[in-house]
């Protein structure tokens, strides 16, 4: 960066090189160039010469003043006009940063995704700080009183093998940057209560042409958890509001859920599960699309689904007798 240049003098910032966004700041430049009494001193920000709010303080020093500085980062340098020198002479440079102290981290959440071998902790960091902000996650065993600390810039994955202090822990997060430090409330967890079952996936759908046509959604999960509660939500792609069905599920076999839907309508389905009675849900599964036939039976397979929503990509549906193409970009 600009800070690595060889200096013939120095440049400094008041109140500091990293300061609160919106502050008034002064940048000073002091020349110490051999055989040069600078006629003029100049400031540059990101390579552009500044023309206002500059004043010479004395023989060797000048000041640049900014009111309400709002740029997160800027590279500053200053130069001198030396008598009998054709070009300006570089004095020094400095990278400056503005931002905010961290907010108090809140909504601290720790979960263990089944089979991951990790406890994943996340939190709401609050407003953007614009400057380098580090987070220290504290994990303290309520049984052994032993505390471990993990440094990160966002979320953290902690190996469950390292959680040797029993099942009950306190977790809290400290946020710190050059402008301040804040600490979250403590979250009490029990390792058995924060497991999220292995992802539930919708594999296919078929509409059976009975007296009243019904659609069967096939879905499954690799979870080994015995008591699992799930929700499936569905809607016509043109609708805004979801319909939700609840299930108590045993994943020893593929699940089949029946729906009585309107004919010749494109529907979207999603599923999520949690260990029964626990706090945390899986995220909703990928969108699964199925268009009900006018009257003819139809099967839609997972193989013809895409995971992107509103991407404008094409979804293929298997119908009896021919292959149809539907645009995916029309869900409400």
């Amino acid at each position: 960066g600009i800070t690595n240049i060889n200096c013939s003098g120095h440049i400094w910032v008041e109140p500091a090189t990293i300061f609160k966004m919106g502050m008034n700041i002064s940048i000073y430049c002091q020349a110490a160039i051999k055989n040069c009494q600078p006629r003029k001193l100049h400031f540059y920000k990101n390579g552009i010469k500044e023309r206002f709010q500059i004043t010479r303080i004395n023989k060797t020093t000048a000041r640049l003043w900014y009111k309400n500085f709002l740029e997160p980062h800027a590279s500053m340098y200053c130069t001198a006009e030396c008598p009998k020198h054709f070009q300006e002479t570089l004095i020094c440079g400095k990278d400056i940063s503005s931002g905010y102290p961290p907010d108090i981290p809140d909504e601290v959440t720790c979960v263990i995704y089944e089979y991951s071998g990790n406890m994943t902790c996340t939190w709401n960091a609050g407003k953007l700080t614009y400057i380098d902000t580090k987070y220290v996650v504290h994990v303290k065993s309520l049984e052994t009183e032993e505390e471990q600390q993990y440094l990160t810039s966002s979320y953290i994955n902690i190996s469950t093998d390292s959680l040797q202090g029993g099942k009950k822990y306190l977790v809290w997060v400290q946020a710190a940057n050059a402008l301040g430090m804040e600490e979250s409330k403590q979250l009490q967890i029990h390792l058995d209560d924060i497991v999220i079952p292995s992802a539930a996936v919708i594999s296919r759908a078929e509409t059976i042409n009975a007296t009243v046509p019904k659609t069967i959604i096939y879905w499954d999960s690799q979870t080994t958890i015995e008591k699992v509660s799930c929700e499936m939500r569905y809607k016509a792609t043109t609708n805004q509001t979801w319909n939700v069905k609840e299930f108590d599920t045993n994943f020893t076999y593929v699940q089949q859920s029946e729906f009585y839907l309107e004919p010749n309508i494109k529907y979207v389905f999603q599923v999520r599960c949690q260990e029964t009675g626990k706090r945390y849900w899986q995220p909703w599964s990928s969108l699964f699309f199925h268009k009900t036939p006018e009257t003819v039976p139809q099967v839609t397979s997972k193989a013809f689904q895409h995971d992107t929503w509103n991407s404008g990509l094409t979804v293929a549906s298997i119908s009896t007798g021919h292959l149809t193409s539907d645009n995916r970009g029309d869900i409400g």
Partner: nanobody, 128 residues
Framework: EVQLVESGGALVQPGESLRLSCVVS????????IGWFRQAPGKGREGVSC????????AYADSVKGRFTISRDKAKNTVYLQMNALRPEDTAVYSC?????????????????????WGRGTQVTVSS
């Protein structure tokens, strides 16, 4: 931005004295060097003298050394040019100029290109 207003110009006889004033207003904290320039009829603008606000260092053109003296009154935001032993060749419109970044060292002869703010000038005529 600073505003500069000159006064004190007059018709005088050779050998007489005159004091010109330059009042600086506006954002007076932003200027550093104040210079005096003159422009005789049919000629280019010529640097006469300058002074630094920070330390009072002064500089003069060779043609006026020993006859003219520049000074400042910080409290009044005014710069003066005391002109003694005036000659007919001193006849010109005298203007003051300011610059926030310029440092007038003792060996410096004021250059028009070094100054960014200008007054409108005051007429000095030396004639018998």
């Amino acid at each position: 931005e600073v505003q500069l207003v000159e006064s004190g110009g007059a018709l005088v006889q050779p050998g007489e004295s005159l004091r010109l004033s330059c009042v600086v207003s506006g954002d007076t904290s932003t200027y550093h060097a104040i210079g005096w320039f003159r422009q005789a009829p049919g000629k280019g603008r010529e640097g006469v003298s300058c002074i630094n606000r920070s330390d009072g260092t002064t500089a003069y053109a060779d043609s006026v050394k020993g006859r003219f003296t520049i000074s400042r009154d910080k409290a009044k935001n005014t710069v003066y040019l005391q002109m003694n032993a005036l000659r007919p060749e001193d006849t010109a419109v005298y203007s003051c100029a300011a610059d926030p970044m310029l440092y007038c060292d003792t060996d410096y002869e004021p250059q028009t290109t070094d100054f960014t703010s200008w007054g409108r000038g005051t007429q000095v005529t030396v004639s018998s």
